[in-house]
Amino acid sequence: KSPIFGPEEVNSVEGNSVSITCYYPPTSVNRHTRKYWCRQGARGGCITLISSEGYVSSKYAGRANLTNFPENGTFVVNIAQLSQDDSGRYKCGLGINSRGLSFDVSLEVSQGPGLLNDTKVYTVDLGRTVTINCPFKTENAQKRKSLYKQIGLYPVLVIDSSGYVNPNYTGRIRLDIQGTGQLLFSVVINQLRLSDAGQYLCQAGDDSNSNKKNADLQVLKPEPELVYEDLRGSVTFHCALGPEVANVAKFLCRQSSGENCDVVVNTLGKRAPAFEGRILLNPQDKDGSFSVVITGLRKEDAGRYLCGAHSDGQLQEGSPIQAWQLFVNEESTIPRSPTVVKGVAGSSVAVLCPYNRKESKSIKYWCLWEGAQNGRCPLLVDSEGWVKAQYEGRLSLLEEPGNGTFTVILNQLTSRDAGFYWCLTNGDTLWRTTVEIKIIEGEPNLKVPGNVTAVLGETLKVPCHFPCKFSSYEKYWCKWNNTGCQALPSQDEGPSKAFVNCDENSRLVSLTLNLVTRADEGWYWCGVKQGHFYGETAAVYVAVEERKAAGSRDVSLAKADAAPDEKVLDSGFREIENKAIQDPRLFAEEKAVADTRDQADGSRASVDSGSSEEQGGSSRHHHHHH
């Protein structure tokens, strides 16, 4: 499929000008290659009319130009003094005309309307309001006022001052007669339809002395704004319909076959299942404008979108609308990353978030998508050291591996963590990605004690048992704080006896805290990594208390406190479930790897409807030793 994009149809009138914008992926090669505008012949060729290399056909001499905007990835063809001969099929493209890197454009130039003398032309957008002004003389001040529409050869009464209203205009038309000082009446038509366009005649009086005025009403269907975005990227539709519809329900819909327009999202709470987790409707301003953001763009998202206002929250005849034609460029600069990450309850996930590598200094954010109230995304963690209180000790955002990717680790998973999360930065807003976390059944990999109590001034040793499957991975202990997890020295104690059917490659790695102080209290994580790619983690809360009896503490799994909701195994080991599906590069041997398929079927893990304040549920005070 060609990555070139432009307007499918361009309509104009004889004597006018058009400006046609064509989009291309702004790679270095594309920015500098030839751009052209050619006319398609009946036998399939395409004859160049103008190109970026300076060629201008004699047909276009003095009335056309082509300008390249390499920084935007666009070029613009301007054509003036249009005639009906210019109607036809064209291509805008890159390189050689026959190469296929092009987009088909249909140009339709029509004759200007043949208007009667003294005809007032009203040009109004679909769904808006028009006021047709009708002057009259004093002798007709007391006589009947009327507005007719020319249908074929016959004038059809639309409205008159005796109270008649044509059924096609019921509820959306009125006739106003100005005060005695002004010899003028006006007809106001709201919620204009395409079918309202045409020739009108207003009249004061019915005899030969009546005053008449011709009006030509042109109702414009909005030209779609062209939007060119990358696959897996995001798009923002800014919808400004005017203050007159500030209090009317708003919608965004996508045109399907024919005139149908399927609601994508509206302010009445409707949302299409295909957009679950990847759409947010920003609340409207006082002037009634609003915006809709869609992330994780898919090929099938391409098409025509309309935003509008109607009490039903969907497109109806006479809705004021704005239109966009979205093209999804499959030659995307945004790398693939898992759209679904699975983790076992009690375990952890490590989510990779892509960002524009030119913006390495931007602030990175990770937020929880909430579908209620048209969508919010409350911040959970950022790269500046802020962590939502309910997530202390179990959530960390790491700048690693860097170079266009950051990592978010969430551990102590519960079923309430299932849901959609967004990766954002304060830089390039096109780089917003969505990941769904699913909580699955399974067994843990890492085994650590429950909450541990250390004694001031003594030595504490905390074990972490790694199964043999992690033999080739780097094993670490770190102390969590709101800016990350600071690595600590640890000791390899040899093979672990905590696993059945696991050979000598299993490992017991201990964290030793010498001469414990109050500052040692807090969350500690053990985990695995490979270079800068993080795998599973398990968390332990270490509480510090006053000395009771001398000596050092060597915490075994059996002696550790079993926290609520965690199972104690028959062997005496307490197991914190800790299997997570991570970056496929890390855990290629695992069967269920992060699922990168688009989840358009609506089969997603359920998210508790509790508020975001309740999410998490694993903050420090829950884990103190009593």
């Epitope: 995304c377 050291g385 807003t429």
Partner: nanobody
Framework: QVQLVESGGGLVQAGDSLRLSCAAS????????MGWFRQAPGQEREFVAA????????YYADSVKGRFTISRDNAKNTVYLQMNSLEPGDTANYYC????????????????????????WGQGTQVTVSS
């Protein structure tokens, strides 16, 4: 809701120092940025300094860089503004402001220097610098 109470204002000579405090109470777990703004009579309210509540990154208006220092004590839910080398042009009402963590996409675009980014405001404390 978050309530903010400023203190520490007063009348000083040019070149002197002053330390303003702002104590936050209420739902302080939602705090994201805290900042100081000032408003001289007949002037617009202007940004002075801000601090990120998590990592402590600081932001300053060019006019106070090198003279003013913003700091925080998370345990006390308090933010401070240490003002050194005060000038008569620093005379104004000083307001403490708090911003909660972003929730809507537009929130993420707002900068700590923007007055519109802040959700909660104190009553202000007067600082007068005489020459």
């Amino acid at each position: 809701q978050v309530q903010l109470v400023e203190s520490g204002g007063g009348l000083v000579q040019a070149g002197d120092s002053l330390r303003l405090s702002c104590a936050a109470s209420g739902r302080t777990s939602s705090l994201y940025n805290m900042g100081w703004f000032r408003q001289a009579p007949g002037q617009e309210r202007e940004f002075v300094a801000a601090i990120h509540w998590g990592g402590g990154r600081t932001y300053y208006a060019d006019s106070v860089k090198g003279r003013f220092t913003i700091s925080r004590d998370n345990a006390k839910n308090t933010v401070y503004l240490q003002m050194n080398s005060l000038e008569p042009g620093d005379t104004a009402n000083y307001y403490c402001a708090a911003r909660r963590a972003p929730e809507l996409l537009d929130d993420y675009k707002q900068k700590p220097e923007e007055i519109g980014a802040y959700h909660y405001w104190g009553q202000g404390t007067q600082v007068t610098v005489s020459s």
